[in-house]
């Protein structure tokens, strides 16, 4: 059996069949003789008891209040009362989008990774026995699928699969034709699994400097969102007042990874800054990667092969 309507705030589109089912249904069957009442209140109207005479569009049976169909003026608060049990819903009926096969407010978005399993299944368990046929549309164009009772797509996702998929169930009630639409916005993305972070450039960098001048050491990496990039130098980081770590800069790549750079600024370079390792490390769940910078006096450049220099 279809479960109850538990969400207290419900938005529905005008012109579609709709139902409210209270959540003490099993209990209600046990006490058949108990008075069960449905009420509506909206704006100035206080609680008005609902019954089939209230409107030809309203049907009451067992635990359910049905609308055939729901219309804009059905907006309001609804109450089910039985003995000391009360359940309340706030119903908001919105206008149908006349220019589309679906209404944007009624969309369920899902993000699927390319090559991963992707499925759309058109089912409606409550109205199942009344459904004549069901059609599946992609971007409001009907898809030709074998099963016209429960159309289904099951495949490995490709980028071309991206789009709005609308399941439209057609059903008859009291000689009238109705339809119910359920729409999914499917976005196909690149593989989101984590990469092994990598520091860009050579692992060892000799930087030619002049005493008394400033230098900026730039450390860049391709990494995951949660990975960290940091500098290590000297006995204790921060002991040299001339050394400053600048704020990390991050730019997201089209693949959803991050390009990060962190600058170490050394001001008023002294002898103590020469020939020591300034290490930049990227750390992730999968381990770490480190690259090193060594400051060398410009006069000593001739002793080091040119290809190891970072200008």
């Amino acid at each position: 059996a279809e479960s109850c309507t538990s969400r207290p705030h419900i938005t529905v589109v005008e012109g579609e069949p709709f139902y409210l089912k209270h959540c003490s249904c099993s209990l209600a069957h046990e006490i058949e003789t108990t008075t069960k009442s449905w009420y509506k209140s909206s704006g100035s109207q206080e609680h008005v008891e609902l019954n089939p005479r209230s409107s030809s569009r309203i049907a009451l049976h067992d635990c359910v209040l049905e609308f055939w169909p729901v219309e804009l003026n059905d907006t309001g608060s609804y109450f089910f009362q039985m003995k000391n049990y009360t359940q309340k819903w706030k119903l908001n009926v919105i206008r149908r989008n006349k220019h589309s096969c679906f209404t944007e407010r009624q969309v369920t978005s899902k993000i699927v990774e390319v090559k991963k399993f992707f499925q759309i299944t058109c089912e409606n368990s409550y109205y199942q026995t009344l459904v004549n046929s069901t059609s599946l549309y992609k971007n409001c164009k009907k898809l030709l699928l074998e099963n016209n009772k429960n159309p289904t797509i099951k495949k490995n996702a490709e980028f071309e699969d991206q789009g709005y998929y609308s399941c439209v169930h057609f059903l008859h009630h009291n000689g009238k034709l109705f339809n119910i639409t359920k729409t999914f916005n499917i976005t196909i993305v690149e593989d989101r699994s984590n990469i092994v972070p990598v520091l860009l450039g050579p692992k060892l960098n000799h930087v030619a400097v002049e005493l008394g001048k400033n230098v900026r050491l730039n450390c860049s990496a391709l990494l995951n969102e949660e990975d960290v990039i940091y500098w290590m130098f000297g006995e204790e980081n921060g002991s040299d007042p001339n050394i400053h770590e600048e704020k990390e800069m991050r730019i997201m790549t089209p693949e959803g990874k991050w390009h990060a750079s962190k600058v170490l600024r050394i001001e008023n370079i002294g002898e103590s800054n020469l020939n020591v390792l300034y290490n930049c490390t990227v750390a992730s769940t999968g381990g770490t990667d480190t690259k090193s910078f060594i400051l060398v006096r410009k006069a000593d450049m001739a002793d080091i092969p040119g290809h190891v220099f970072t200008r």
Partner: antibody
Framework: QVQLVQSGAEVKKPGASVKVSCKAS????????MHWVRQAPGQGLEWMGT????????YYNQKFQGRATMTVDTSTSTVYMELSSLRSEDTAVYYC??????????????WGQGTTVTVSS | DIQMTQSPSSLSASVGDRVTITCQAS??????????MHWYQQKPGKAPKLLIY???NLETGVPSRFSGSGSGTDFTFTISSLQPEDIATYYC?????????FGQGTKLEIK
């Protein structure tokens, strides 16, 4: 009326895994999405991911991709969240919470009581 | 991904004061007349509690002194007259797209 009941507190060693359960009662289990939100001590709320019980579709916050696994058992209206390769930063209160399936309705009106997970050597 | 920037991170106010918290999304969270922004209250040791949904709708049972407004990227949460029981941390949350995201929170204290 609607209730989400979570499993009890856990103490784990770094590198281990933890599996937290969340049982839903008295409501349309398969018409709502279930989410996991965590809160480290003294920190804010962090959305971890979601599962649609109707088809087991999952989507994870990139931060937890590959480490978190959300599953559902519709026969018992229970969702599970397993977090592997635990580290001390995973010490937090883990909440399950429910929302509607439409994008507009993905706000959290019912919450579990929270499960404290402590990661310590 | 949509980043949420909430301000201030903390604030101190007196009972009866009007309190305003803002939340800015890194891109629009509004579509066709709806804004997919929601507000929560969290007291120490408790689960968060929904106060406002879809930018301006008051959750059932929440006092009318709480309100929300805004559209696009800029949203405001207001307590018209601060009460002692309102001491808590407040969070905004967007549901325009996955991944869902929260603001970093605003801790509200009584002067």
């Amino acid at each position: 009326q609607v209730q989400l009941v979570q499993s009890g507190a856990e103490v784990k060693k770094p590198g281990a895994s933890v599996k937290v359960s969340c049982k839903a009662s008295d409501y349309t289990f398969t018409s709502n999405w279930m989410h996991w939100v965590r809160q480290a001590p003294g920190q804010g709320l962090e959305w971890m991911g979601t599962i649609d019980p109707s088809d087991s579709y999952t989507y994870y916050n990139q931060k937890f991709q590959g480490r978190a696994t959300m599953t559902v058992d519709t026969s018992t209206s229970t969702v599970y969240m397993e977090l592997s390769s635990l580290r001390s930063e995973d010490t937090a209160v883990y909440y399950c919470t429910t929302s509607g399936d439409y994008d507009a309705d993905r706000y959290f009106d019912v919450w579990g009581q929270g499960t404290t997970v402590t990661v310590s050597s | 991904d949509i980043q949420m920037t909430q301000s201030p991170s903390s604030l101190s106010a007196s009972v009866g004061d009007r309190v305003t918290i803002t939340c800015q999304a890194s891109k629009s969270v509004s579509t066709s007349g709806d804004s997919y922004m929601h507000w929560y209250q969290q007291k120490p040791g408790k689960a968060p509690k929904l106060l406002i949904y879809l930018a301006s709708n008051l959750e059932t049972g929440v006092p009318s002194r709480f309100s929300g407004s805004g559209s696009g990227t800029d949203f405001t949460f207001t307590i018209s007259s601060l009460q002692p029981e309102d001491i808590a941390t407040y969070y905004c949350q967007q549901s325009r797209e996955l991944p869902l995201s929260f603001g970093q929170g605003t801790k509200l204290e009584i002067k």
